[in-house]
Amino acid sequence: DAHKSEVAHRFKDLGEENFKALVLIAFAQYLQQCPFEDHVKLVNEVTEFAKTCVADESAENCDKSLHTLFGDKLCTVATLRETYGEMADCCAKQEPERNECFLQHKDDNPNLPRLVRPEVDVMCTAFHDNEETFLKKYLYEIARRHPYFYAPELLFFAKRYKAAFTECCQAADKAACLLPKLDELRDEGKASSAKQRLKCASLQKFGERAFKAWAVARLSQRFPKAEFAEVSKLVTDLTKVHTECCHGDLLECADDRADLAKYICENQDSISSKLKECCEKPLLEKSHCIAEVENDEMPADLPSLAADFVESKDVCKNYAEAKDVFLGMFLYEYARRHPDYSVVLLLRLAKTYETTLEKCCAAADPHECYAKVFDEFKPLVEEPQNLIKQNCELFEQLGEYKFQNALLVRYTKKVPQVSTPTLVEVSRNLGKVGSKCCKHPEAKRMPCAEDYLSVVLNQLCVLHEKTPVSDRVTKCCTESLVNRRPCFSALEVDETYVPKEFNAETFTFHADICTLSEKERQIKKQTALVELVKHKPKATKEQLKAVMDDFAAFVEKCCKADDKETCFAEEGKKLVAASQAALGL
């Protein structure tokens, strides 16, 4: 359905408030260093222009594409070259190359100051003084730090953010009311950003087919009563939504997501019995709720998969006539029967099945060739099961902090070239799999753990891509999306690594560590642990544990001392000497 003016079409569909918010998100995700005020000015200009097009779709420039309009607007920024360097060269290009150029310059780890949370009273005053600016600032700060954040979902976060301030700034104990809510939003926001980053990486690095396969598996687990044709329709629509958002087409993305939510709710009888509550909510909550809805119950008496996919004489005929449809049906049928499997495992099984058919449907005796294909699945299923069992046992034995430390050591030994902040961030997140997933019963552990690990390892991949330092990381990240986790799991100690030179400064600590939050203090200690392993990659667990125990005792002792700084200076030197001796540095 072609519209004379795309910008007018989206303005009318989304409404002014959402239009402005989405344009702000889009601009902040592209120009991540620009000041807030500059973005607000650009957004206001675009909004005023959109209104003229709503009034008269034939008005000058109203027929231009959104990329052209937004790109032209971004290219008016005066300090583009000084602030962004070569990104300014994008402006010399024509659409669609210009937009592709902007996309390529999105920075997953922008050099921006950490967001420091002001005092509650300060925040409440700012909220009351100018609610609109306060909420825009939230969108801006999140969007520029998370350039792939799922824009329509960020609108939902902003709505919750507003609700938290509206409620808590009137409460007797503002802090007790507000801070837990803000912590929850922050943690959920980070998780949401990372999940969306994997979707965009899947689309951009591995293509639409890879994303569609992921979506078939996930939606089939979630909606096992839905017919294959219904799941296929949802997959097609969902792929369009995410392709748009990942491509910076945020207005189209939000609009199409709303249409998809509407369709799902209108057809919930043929999709899932679990959608009723979601579909009673307002739009943003509804879309979020649908995205998080629990798996429906599996239909009773589903027949064996072997009949259609192994025993049938038409297996090769069906495969050859429509490969992706047949493989899609296989994935659908397998996934709806296995909510207990991770999506990535299901995709590995489908890949194995595809490889077998590619081979066997060219063989002299196809049936004999593929007859045992399901037997090949057994080791693929057992590998993540065993890994999760072992790691959950380790987590229960150690607790989260020490489990993270075990992973820090493990991953630093695998890929010691990776920067210390990245190793700390990624290993801490990998370690969170324990508290997130190990509490679940067996049937829910694998989908929770392995699909979460896929999200975390994607963080490593996108951070590493910006400044590649390890061929092993590049190999695991680029060879196969679904085999990333097994690839990293299989890495042993990097024997080619030349240990880092010892630098006493790295292990010098000051009294400021005492005032840090428990989390920040952990990060300091974990940073030291990574550096230690980089200096002594062959150190044993016992050696590292002894040094880390001494280090913890040292911090505790000096933080209790009257003259903390002196304690850190003197005891620190002793600790470094003792550690060097213990590790033979």
Epitope: C316, A320, E358, C361, A362, A363, A364, D365, P366
Partner: antibody, heavy 118, light 106 residues
């Protein structure tokens, strides 16, 4: 582009063995069956067997079991057929051919002429 | 094993004439493929998966059939079509070829 280059003509004594090669290029050698076909002068085509270089799986025409042995080497992307206990009946042109989905042979080598004579 | 019988063994056709040759299988087969061979050269895949034309094959050729009965048709014979045509079945081990139909130009 896909190419199958076979070794040159062979003249051998009865009772001996011969190994014919087929060097593949221009495609993922491991992922396609390599078939071998026999053609005697003025006669039709006879399928000998096939090998899957990816894992070494083979299928043979029963008539050639014990006569032909198929192997493949992934690093020089070459398939081989060894013929043993040769007799004049084995004199023929032997051709390698790449097998694809649903069993057709889309690319063929130029053929190797084997003459068994005392 | 499945025996493929091609008929006729030899045939000739004038330029512009319609040509049909058949391949009959001793049991039902899944797919039939056809190859063209000219003297002194290796066979070339001509029609595959029963009815698909191989790359570069003129559209005057067509293939059809199912079960035990298959055919190759040339809508309008041309001189360059003179060759031997072999059918080959897939779906039963061992793979087998017909004895060939030799097509000559009148």
């Amino acid at each position: 582009q896909v190419q199958l280059q076979q070794s040159g003509a062979e003249l051998v004594r009865p009772g001996s063995s011969v190994k014919i090669s087929c060097k593949a290029s221009g495609y993922a050698f491991s992922n396609y069956w390599m078939n071998w076909v026999k053609q005697r002068p003025g006669q039709g085509l006879e399928w000998i067997g096939q090998i899957y270089p990816g894992d070494g799986d083979t299928y043979y025409n029963g008539r050639f079991k014990g006569k032909a042995t198929l192997t493949a080497d992934k690093s020089p992307t070459t398939a081989y057929m060894q013929l043993s206990s040769l007799t004049s009946e084995d004199s023929a042109v032997y051709v390698c051919a790449r097998g694809v989905l649903l069993g057709s042979f889309d690319y063929w080598g130029q053929g190797t002429t084997l003459t068994v004579s005392s | 094993q499945i025996v493929l019988t091609q008929s006729p063994a030899i045939m000739s056709a004038s330029p512009g004439e319609k040509v049909t040759m058949t391949c009959s299988a001793s049991s039902s087969v899944s797919y039939m493929h056809w190859y063209q061979q000219k003297s002194g050269t290796s066979p070339k895949r001509w029609i595959y998966d029963t009815s698909k034309l191989a790359s570069g094959v003129p559209v005057r050729f067509s293939g059809s059939g199912s079960g035990t009965s298959y055919s190759l048709t040339i809508r309008s014979m041309e001189a360059e079509d003179a060759a031997t045509y072999y059918c080959q079945q897939w779906g039963s081990n061992p793979l087998t070829f017909g004895a060939g139909t030799k097509l000559e130009i009148k």
